[in-house]
Every structure is written in C-alpha cells, then in structure tokens.
C-alpha cells in the first residue's frame, strides 16, 4: 500500500504475493536513493489505479519481473 | 494463525503518558503496515496512526498530531503507541490492526486495550 | 475533509434484506476502495466487504457491497438476515492514503 506523496520511502506495506500481470497498468522498480534506501517496486492496477508495493526479496515477485520484462522484450522491435 | 495482542492501557491522569503495545505472530511482521485505531465508549471507530512496514512512515490523525508517537521493533515483533499530554476525549478502547499485504483493508485486529484518562 | 456519513440505526426481520448507506462529501467516494467492517457487541471489528464489493473468505454471500457514483454513495446490502447479524456496521475508505477515515457507524438491528 503506497502513499500518494512521497516521504522517504513510499511503500506502507509490501506483499510477497504477484499480482496478475492481465491486471497490471504498470510495474515500477524505483532504485534505491538518498530518500530511501531499498528498491521499491509498484504495482498500478488498471482498476481505480490502485498502487501496491511488492516485496523485491520474494521469489515469486522476481519470477513476476522476468515475466513482464520477457513479456515487454517481446512486445519491443 | 495471524495474532495482534494489545497490552499497556489502564487509568491514567490528564496531561500524563501511557505507552500501549502490541505483540504480532502468525504472519511476517515486518511486511506490514500496521494500523492504530480507537472507539471511545459506546461511540464509533477513529483512525488513530499508521506506521510502515519499515518504520520509515508514519502518519496520524489531526487529533493526535504532535501528542502520539507509533513506533514498531521488527527484530520483536511489536508495535507501540507513546500517548504524552493525554486529555479526557483519549478515552477509548486502542486497537491495533493489521494491513492485508496485498490491499488496503485491516484484516485482522486486535482485541483491544482500554485507556482511561480521568482525574 | 474527506467525511462518510451512515444512518445512525437500521432494522429489519429475519430472512428480509436491508440495505446500509454511506455517503461521501468533500471528495469523489469512487475515488479509492470502501471497505466494510462489522462489529459484533464486546467484539473486535471484521472485515465483512473491501474493495468495493469483494468478500473476504468465510464472510457468507449473503453480504454484498455496492458503489454508486451518482449519489456519492456506497452500500452495504444483507439478504437473508439473521440474528447473528445484529451488530454495527462501518464503512471507511480515504481520500489519500494512509490517512483513513471512517463512518459513524450503523446499528443494525434484526427485530
């Protein structure tokens, strides 16, 4: 769950669960910074636009970003 | 299963402190977002404060602004709330509840720790 | 201020259907989910409906929540009711997230 301003870190909470790619508006991976020190990654969902804040240590969110960057290698020419 | 346990309330005098805790297991803590939020007597549920999963956010309720502090020791499992400058409408019952990891609902709560602030 | 306004009290017979509102003013109530959250008498809050209208596991489907962006509004309906459901009602939802904000509550009431 994100805030809708930026303080430091964004992400309220993470999930180790991934989310339907089908749902997914876009993925961001924000890179660690002097306002935060860890890799945030979110999750707009195309209902409402809807963040959520995945958990970069989980093994099923590192199997979601290789999906989508597969996915997106593909989509390029 | 998942567990919120809340600890510290009691009857304390205006203008004193009371530091209320909350002992979580059954679920991995330190992914949480947690939640405080009270009920006064025979009234209706307040947001209180939330912290983030890191500690590294945290917000409150203009009622309590500059008064409470929510704090949280992942490495225990626990969730605090520090209550300093306490008045009479602090009266409630505090619940601390949890963050669903993947939405924006509290899906599980505590059940409760009571605050009374009389003189 | 982002406020949620619910009718103070309801009731209904067993087996009928009534339905709880809760209307938003100073911002778009469709904006961000609703959930719902019932509490028994001495109990703790539950989670009856989130995001709109989903249920969470073991919360009958007699339950439903509703949005009407006509109305600013959004619903809580129960069918079927029963005496086990006698108990207050809230809807919450935000204008900007985390800073939550909750309705005054309904007291169902199953005559």
């Known amino acids: 769950v994100p805030l809708s301003r930026t303080v430091r870190c964004t992400c309220i909470s993470i999930s180790n669960q991934p989310v339907n790619p089908r749902s997914l508006e876009k993925l961001e991976i924000i890179p660690a910074s002097q306002f935060c020190p860890r890799v945030e990654i979110i999750a707009t969902m195309k209902k409402k636009g809807e963040k959520r804040c995945l958990n970069p240590e989980s093994k099923a969110i590192k199997n979601l970003l290789k999906a989508v960057s597969k996915e997106r290698s593909k989509r390029s020419p | 299963q998942v567990q919120l346990v809340e600890s510290g309330g009691g009857v304390v005098q205006p203008g004193r402190s009371l530091r209320l805790s909350c002992a979580a297991s059954g679920f991995t803590f330190s992914n949480s977002g947690i939640h405080w939020v009270r009920q006064a007597p025979g009234k209706g549920l307040e947001w209180v404060a939330v912290i983030s999963y890191d500690g590294s956010n945290k917000f409150y309720a203009d009622s309590v602004k500059g008064r409470f502090t929510i704090s949280r020791d992942n490495s225990k499992n626990t969730l605090y709330l520090q209550m300093n400058s306490l008045r009479a409408e602090d009266t409630a019952v505090y619940y601390c509840a949890k963050l669903r990891d993947n939405g924006e609902y509290l899906d599980y709560w505590g059940q409760g720790t009571l605050v009374t602030v009389s003189s | 201020n982002f406020m949620l306004t619910q009718p103070h009290s309801v009731s209904e017979s067993p087996g009928k259907t009534v339905t709880i509102s809760c209307t938003g003013s100073?911002?778009?109530?469709?904006?961000?989910?609703v959930q719902w959250y019932q509490q028994r008498p001495g109990s703790s809050p539950t989670t009856v409906i989130y995001e709109d209208n989903q249920r969470p596991s073991g919360v009958p489907d007699r339950f439903s929540g509703s949005i009407d962006s006509s109305s600013n509004s959004a619903s809580l309906t129960i069918s079927g009711l029963k005496t086990e459901d006698e108990a207050d009602y809230y809807c919450q939802s935000y204008v900007e997230t985390p800073e939550w904000v909750f309705g005054g509550g309904t007291k169902l009431t199953v005559l």
């Open positions: 100073g911002g778009s109530i469709d904006r961000n989910y």
